[in-house]
């Protein structure tokens, strides 16, 4: 807490300018009028205040607006936004996309903080829906934001937004989300050539159907085991040994280390043992030679 002290003679701030960087914390508290600060917030971001000085400026705004800052102030918070707590932000009513962009810009290049998450939540709730413009803005700043949306919300994501997604941004997506995102990614990257296409689509393949995996197996993509292990089990099961071998290329040797884990374990159980033996990896658990395999799902469809 900053001490309440009188402003020294001649130090009363007439405007928010760079001369204030030389003010001690107590001088800022005593000599800067909160209303002046609020009307000239756009200048604060251009002035190299220290974090301690920013604490004082925030304190002055908090006193002036105990119920929450008006949007005219919020839009110009700049780096002062980094000083806000989620509790502060919950008092705000942010309706302008420009305000949202201005604050996201401050946090650009960093992980989504609790402050940003709260800001986005307040903004989306204030708008009543997640419209395309908002989503474009959020995915531009935080591609990982996609994984925090429900499959229903993801259905409105434009394929163009997919271009901004980095592989690590999908780490927290579950299969239901990837089911929605994969077709959009496929559409977004459809005009790329084979190897470039695979690089881009790879992180979305957790939502790929069997037929797309079969198609990829014909393109010498050399999928790594980490990607293979994230594929949908139901999409992997129908693949033949030959198709998996082509899909993985030199990485096929990694199957041995993963033979106890899904989806490899389930896939092995569906393959003939003599087919598995052709891989020369010592994979065990396939259908013994001479056994007849009935596809019950097909039988049900025919009856």
């Amino acid at each position: 807490e900053v001490e309440k002290t009188a402003c020294p003679s001649g130090k009363k701030a007439r405007e928010i300018d760079e001369s204030l960087i030389f003010y001690k914390k107590w001088e800022l508290e005593a000599c800067v009028d909160a209303a002046l600060l609020a009307t000239q917030m756009d200048r604060v971001n251009a002035i190299p205040f220290t974090y301690e000085q920013l604490d004082v400026l925030k304190h002055k705004l908090d006193e002036l607006y105990p119920q929450g800052y008006p949007e005219s102030v919020i839009q110009h918070l700049g780096y002062l936004f980094l000083k806000m707590s989620p509790e502060d932000i919950r008092k705000w009513n942010v309706t302008s996309l420009e305000t949202l962009k201005a604050l996201l810009e401050v946090n650009k290049g960093h992980e989504m903080s609790p402050q940003v998450a709260t800001l986005i939540d307040r903004f989306v709730k204030g708008r009543g829906q997640l419209d395309k413009d908002t989503l474009d803005t959020l995915t531009a700043f935080y591609p990982g934001y996609l994984c925090s949306l429900s499959p229903e919300e993801l259905s409105s994501v434009p394929p163009s937004s997919i271009w901004a997604v980095r592989p690590q941004d999908l780490d927290t997506c579950d299969p239901r989300q990837l089911d929605v995102l994969y077709p959009k990614a496929r559409l977004a990257f459809q005009n790329m050539n084979g190897s470039e296409y695979f690089v881009k689509i790879q992180s979305f393949l957790g939502g790929a159907p069997t037929e797309d995996l079969k198609a990829l197996s014909q393109q010498n993509v050399s999928m790594d085991l980490a990607t293979f292990m994230k594929l949908r089990t139901d999409a992997v099961l129908p693949l033949t040994v030959a198709e998996v071998q082509k899909l993985l290329g030199p990485h096929v040797e990694g199957l041995k280390a993963e033979e106890r884990h899904r989806p490899v374990r389930d896939w092995i159980l569906r393959q003939r043992q003599d087919d598995l033996d052709t891989l020369g990896l010592g994979l065990q658990g396939g259908i013994p030679n001479g056994y007849l395999v009935l596809d019950l799902s097909m039988q049900e469809a025919l009856s």
């Epitope: 760079e18 001369s19 960087i21 030389f22 001690k24 190299p48």
Partner: antibody, heavy 120, light 107 residues
């Protein structure tokens, strides 16, 4: 580590302008965490703070010398400079440049100092 | 301006002695006080900042205390290299000001 080195004439005539330059090495003068100060010490006496500058060019001077002092910065050369006009014998002193930690205003490191004598 | 008064202005002590130097500010300066050591012909060297924080590389026999208007620099066991002049400096308000100095001499 950061080192500071003062340079300039050791003798200045009364009424003329004293000019000194401080060259910073081992670190950038554009660091946002520091001010760059000038401090002087008359022979056998104590220390007097003259003023400081931020890399952006903003300055703050000791009111007792404000009318005669100009501090400037050249970030491209990693230097800052002092000009003291209308000097008298009372301005004879060892002049130090120093790095000043923002918020707490402690001086570290200092230059080795340069004696400036005002005499005709 | 804030005036800084040091006492004593000089003192004589022997190696191994415990030495205490005091600094008083003309108004409360919280913990905005720094201590420096200066040897003849040399620039001052920062010992203590923010009243009690030991600067990196400074021997632990040096310590600082105090808050408000009264501050103390203590050398727990005086060493030959500690004979020098010591200055306090307030950084609570500009202009930044120094105490008049305390000269520690060999007894």
């Amino acid at each position: 580590q950061v080192q500071l080195q003062e340079s300039g004439p050791g003798l200045v005539k009364p009424s003329q302008t004293l000019s000194l330059t401080c060259t910073v090495s081992g670190g950038s003068i554009s660091s946002g965490d520091y001010y760059w100060s000038w401090i002087r010490q008359p022979p056998g006496k104590g220390l007097e703070w003259i003023g400081y500058i931020y890399y952006s060019g903003s300055t703050y001077y000791n009111p007792s010398l404000k009318s005669r002092v100009t501090i400037s910065v050249d970030t491209s050369k990693n230097q800052f400079s002092l000009k003291l006009s209308s000097v008298t014998a009372a301005d004879t002193a060892v002049y130090y440049c120093a790095r000043d930690r923002r918020d707490w205003d402690w001086f570290d490191p200092w230059g080795q100092g340069t004696l400036v004598t005002v005499s005709s | 301006d804030i005036q800084m008064t040091q006492s004593p202005s000089s003192l004589s002590a022997s190696v191994g002695d415990r030495v205490t130097i005091t600094c008083r500010a003309s108004q409360s300066i919280s913990s905005y006080l720094n201590w420096y050591q200066q040897k003849p012909g040399k620039a001052p060297k920062l010992l203590i900042y923010a009243a009690s924080s030991l600067q990196s590389g400074v021997p632990s026999r040096f310590s600082g205390s105090g808050s408000g208007t009264d501050f103390t620099l203590t050398i727990s066991s005086l060493q030959p290299e500690d004979f020098a002049t010591y200055y306090c400096q307030q950084s609570y308000s500009t202009p930044l000001t120094f105490g008049g100095g305390t000269k520690v001499e060999i007894k």
